[in-house]
């Protein structure tokens, strides 16, 4: 049974040319996080954070994305095209997969950055990779 909840930075805005931190947090479960995938609105992957192997930033974003803080992601040199949805997908054992959503609006004007922290509905599915279960350590 999946008992966890994903908290995210929710709806955020940031200035064009600036930076923003995308952050998700999994709570209310003892499940071990094995991998976190960060995806953009068009389902293109930005980065992977594997609990055992570390970070991988996808080449298309290598100059604009920095890993962290924590399991989060820092998106730099923002453009108007960065406006849209971002998803964090937590692969866990034994729970399965949790997914969080963040909406980023990139603003032309100098509107102050703000963020709202709130809980969102989760999407889950059973974990099927039994061979993974012996290899995970919690980060």
């Amino acid at each position: 049974m999946m008992t966890g909840t994903i908290e995210t930075t929710g709806n955020i805005s940031a200035k064009k040319g600036g930076s923003v931190i995308l952050q998700c947090h999994l709570s209310s479960t003892m499940a071990q996080v094995t991998q976190v995938n960060w995806e953009q609105h068009d389902h293109s992957l930005l980065a992977i954070r594997n609990a055992e192997l570390g970070w991988h930033i996808y080449p298309a974003f290598k100059d604009r994305v920095a890993p962290g803080p924590g399991l989060g992601l820092t998106l730099q040199s923002l453009t108007m095209n960065d406006t849209g949805e971002y998803f964090c997908t937590y692969h866990t054992y034994p729970d399965g997969t949790y997914r969080g959503r963040i909406f980023l609006e990139v603003l032309e004007s100098s509107v102050a950055e703000h963020s709202a922290r709130f809980q969102i509905p989760i999407e889950g599915r059973d974990y099927k990779d039994d061979d993974d279960k012996h290899h995970h350590h919690h980060h």
Partner: antibody
Framework: EVQLVESGGGLVKPGGSLRLSCAAS????????MSWVRQAPGKGLEWVGR??????????DYAAPVKGRFTISRDDSKNTLYLQMNSLKTEDTAVYYC????????????WGQGTLVTVSS | SYELTQPPSMSVSPGQTASITCSGD??????ACWYQQKPGQSPVLVIY???KRPSGIPERFSGSNSGNTATLTISGTQAMDESDYYC?????????FGGGTKLTVL
């Protein structure tokens, strides 16, 4: 010890089939993106295709010359990568290597010793 | 289809710097990797993700990648560096190798 060991190579007639295996040890195989690379005698390296980890969809990508004829699969419970080769042509003759894709600072750039596939009548 | 171009061969004197180039359309948007291969042996990764060096690879190997060109630089080249060198363009949908450069240490 961290290693990749290929097997299953041999002599096959044009139009025939062969399945190569790559046994991984010493690391968590299920996390790795794995590729097959081949090298024809006296020629350069040629990427054949790859399979992503299940946590990245487990999807496959192939080079144009083998698309539709070759199939890459993995069995994470056996720490094994496979290359099913069908409708083989003489130009498929090569040493076939399995490798880990260079994603992470750990577990990057591992290569097996290779296995020779000869397609000849 | 995507192609990478390398010089087929080049030579360098011991102790000098060798720079092997690899060109491809918008190669800087992908990751460039470099492999060293000696006769009868499996390739060895010497540079990955443009400029990172795997453990065990000497500091004299360095890499860069921007625009349409990736470069492998070997500073203070040694006789043992005589090999074939292959560049590789890597992204999440495809992988391509260059034709290889035979480096001779005179």
């Amino acid at each position: 010890e961290v290693q990749l060991v290929e097997s299953g190579g041999g002599l096959v007639k044009p139009g025939g089939s062969l399945r190569l295996s790559c046994a991984a040890s010493g690391f968590t195989f299920s996390y790795a993106w794995m590729s097959w690379v081949r090298q024809a005698p006296g020629k350069g390296l040629e990427w054949v295709g790859r399979i992503k980890s299940k946590t990245n969809g487990g999807t496959t990508d192939y080079a144009a010359p083998v698309k539709g004829r070759f199939t890459i699969s993995r069995d994470d419970s056996k720490n094994t990568l496979y290359l099913q080769m069908n409708s083989l042509k003489t130009e498929d003759t090569a040493v076939y290597y399995c490798t880990t894709d260079p994603l992470y600072d750990i577990l990057t750039g591992l290569w097996g010793q290779g296995t020779l596939v000869t397609v000849s009548s | 289809s995507y192609e990478l171009t390398q010089p087929p061969s080049m030579s360098v004197s011991p102790g000098q710097t060798a720079s092997i180039t690899c060109s491809g359309d918008k190669l800087g948007d992908k990751y460039a990797c470099w492999y060293q291969q000696k006769p009868g042996q499996s390739p060895v990764l010497v540079i990955y993700q443009d400029s990172k060096r795997p453990s065990g690879i000497p500091e004299r190997f360095s890499g860069s990648n921007s625009g349409n060109t990736a470069t492998l630089t070997i500073s203070g080249t040694q006789a043992m560096d005589e090999s074939d060198y292959y560049c590789q363009a890597w992204d999440s949908s495809t992988v391509v190798f260059g034709g290889g450069t035979k480096l001779t240490v005179l």
